[in-house]
Amino acid sequence: RPSPTLPEQDALPSSEDDDDDDDSSSEEKETDNTKPNPVAPYWTSPEKMEKKLHAVPAAKTVKFKCPSSGTPNPTLRWLKNGKEFKPDHRIGGYKVRYATWSIIMDSVVPSDKGNYTCIVENEYGSINHTYQLDVVERSPHRPILQAGLPANKTVALGSNVEFMCKVYSDPQPHIQWLKHIEVNGSKIGPDNLPYVQILKHSGINSSDAEVLTLFNVTEAQSGEYVCKVSNYIGEANQSAWLTVTRPALEERPAVMTSPLYLEHHHHHH
């Protein structure tokens, strides 16, 4: 650890803390010798778990919380990148505070980057939640996008669709939503770059560039949608597929093409 004046981390997670925590659950008191009704685990404060992407400067402390309850009291364990996470997997270990359903990692370093999953379970059920940790330089850095967004969507013809792209960037990023298209039957232009259509971009006319909304979708709008984010340091992009299905025996609607700007665009997958 960086501080010789502070004790080494406990080798094993410890619940020996005096937290009087609103979030902690205690087993229901039994009355008349009857067993309490079984309850599968559930989140007690899901609103505190909404921030999934945590971009943290090196050396800082990270605290992930999964406040839960259930009957009997659920157990809590943590995975890193889908595998069992043991204290000796990182220098300085980590602390699990069972009273507050939290894991604490001090003095983070780049090797701490990854996905951290809490698993809360009892004999009646299991729930899990994943946080994404990125350890960043405070100085300007490339944009970082939350994993899993935008998400693939399958919707019925005529529905409205919303794609979301969560961005962490310093300096201010430029966000573009692109769709891969065909021009004269070809997806690739003469310059060997894919054809894309710019659907939306951050700027004066975009109220919320992190969200792309498509109204009354047609089959022609099926395909790959790309969230491309750039700043002067670099760029990042992630894509999702839209599948538009239509009921059988229904006449195919006329395809409306919007007069949006076409361009050649180099896109890294």
């Epitope: 502070l6 803390d17 050396a59 605290k63 100085s139």
Partner: antibody, heavy 116, light 109 residues
């Protein structure tokens, strides 16, 4: 045992620039820590000024950001604070400190008075 | 920016328990650290990461953090505990460090 020692003028004229240096001994400034400045006006509370990582990455208190510069000199194992356009309100004890998420080592502090 | 609110003063008789609070929006999601400062001296870390003690700090000092309030508890208070106490967090949203306004602990008698 890491030790920090502030040095610099104890008196600065209004509109001038306050300059302080913090010498780090017993440990490397290139460790996984942030090197911070905190001040305390007479009879008042602690105020975080800003900090620097050995890579040169910095973060500043928004209320002071336009006037503050923190720099690091790895060859001398020290870091420095410059605060421009000072007024009497900048009179305070200035501490340098080592930090991760918390401050685990502090200098003893140096009183800087802004007066003509 | 993030604000931490502490009571300006707390008084307690020797041998009793002192509780100093630190309020902040959803502070339970942050890691809270506590410092003791005696007149003319630099602050000293007494609790970090909500409830951990650095070596050399008596077990009488403990901490908790939940919801919108963190608490520093000093049991069996002694005259030597009289000092100013500050809470501090690194606000992960703004990426800035923040101190509470400080609480003066007075030991009566």
């Amino acid at each position: 045992q890491v030790q920090l020692q502030e040095s610099g003028p104890g008196l600065v004229k209004p509109s001038g620039t306050l300059s302080l240096t913090c010498a780090v001994s017993g440990g490397s400034i290139s460790s996984n820590n942030w090197w911070s400045w905190v001040r305390q006006p007479p009879g008042k509370g602690l105020e975080w000024i800003g900090e620097i990582y050995h890579s040169g990455s910095t973060s500043y208190n928004p209320s002071l950001k336009s006037r503050v510069t923190i720099s690091v000199d790895k060859s001398k194992n020290q870091f420095s604070l410059k605060l421009s356009s000072v007024t009497a309100a900048d009179t305070a004890v200035y501490y340098c400190a080592r930090a991760t998420d918390w401050f685990d080592h502090w200098g003893q502090g140096t009183l800087v008075t802004v007066s003509s | 920016s993030y604000v931490l609110t502490q009571p300006p003063s707390v008084s307690v008789a020797p041998g009793q328990t002192a509780r100093i609070t630190c309020g902040g929006n959803n502070i339970g999601s942050e890691s809270v650290h506590w410092y003791q400062q005696k007149p003319g001296q630099a602050p000293v870390l007494v609790v970090y990461d909500d409830s951990d003690r650095p070596s050399g700090i008596p077990e009488r000092f403990s901490g908790s953090n939940s919801g919108n309030t963190a608490t520093l508890t000093i049991s069996r208070v002694e005259a030597g505990d009289e000092a100013d106490y500050y809470c501090q967090v690194w606000d992960s949203t703004s990426d800035h460090r923040v101190f509470g306004g400080g609480t003066k602990l007075t030991v009566l008698g």
